[in-house]
Amino acid sequence: KAMHVAQPAVVLANSRGTASFVCEYASPGKATEVRVTVLRQADSQVTEVCAATYMMGNELTFLDDSICTGTSSGNQVNLTIQGLRAMDTGLYICKVELMYPPPYYMGIGNGTQIYVIDPEPCPDSD
């Protein structure tokens, strides 16, 4: 009864440093409260990028200072990460937790490799 989480293998950030991807989970139960966390894995270190808890049918709300935004629809979460630079290129893992009602389930995706290319500075025009 493990929970499966699917996410795209690769995403390319746009020129403004914004990357979007869908995190989809196969729920073993009827959850009413779900927590979604985006983790970044670099080498063997894992750090939290952002997290949000939401009630099914309601909007996904990240903290005001978060670099993430998102929307939910059924068992799909559309995640957007903003303000990315080339140095932020890496593997971004979607973790989904079914918080309520019991039992608790956790699912971890295989990760989305996000590539970020810093825009070239505009050449001086004479």
Partner: antibody, heavy 118, light 108 residues
Amino acid sequence: QVQLVESGGGVVQPGRSLRLSCAASGFTFSSYGMHWVRQAPGTGLEWVAVIWYEGRNKYYADPVKGRFTISRDNSKNTLYLQMNSLRDDDTAVYYCARAGDLGAFDIWGQGTMVTVSS
Amino acid sequence: EIVLTQSPGTLSLSPGERATLSCRASQSVSSSYLAWYQQKPGQAPRLLIYGASSRATGIPDRFSGSGSGTDFTLTISRLEPEDFAVYYCQQYGSSPWTSGQGTKVEIK
């Protein structure tokens, strides 16, 4: 450095109460689920309870349901376990443990011994 | 509830030998949610392996984990004196969190 330190253990009579504490340092406490795990003398590890993030969601093992209450104070970086109606078979070393980013229990306290005896 | 059964109960080996510990689940466990812990007398458990095969920070590469479904294995390629301890497997993908009864690796 990342650390968990339990306190509050001791010898208590059956039917009485005890409150354990677990002081966390070196990490953003509110970003992690926190567990209590116990180990009776000479036996294996038994999960007791978990409390998630802001403290709203809690789960308990069947043997302690209705008797134990897990709580946390994120402003004090402290986890608690209130144990009521203690029984002989609650005698164990009690550990607090952090649920790491990927779910496994990556940080453990040193443990505190609880002995229930008349 | 997922029941984990470890075998053997005790493994008697000499330093330098290879240790193979088994953990069998009563129902399928995703490999992403299977961990191994080491515990020495008087000490707290220490995370060795998570996700069935990923070594935790600071764990030497003589420790390796494998398996999927209901059968998982912890292998210690060459036992060092400090490796003699009790080892537990645990599933953490759903509540209640459950562990095996442990395998003691003792000096022969």
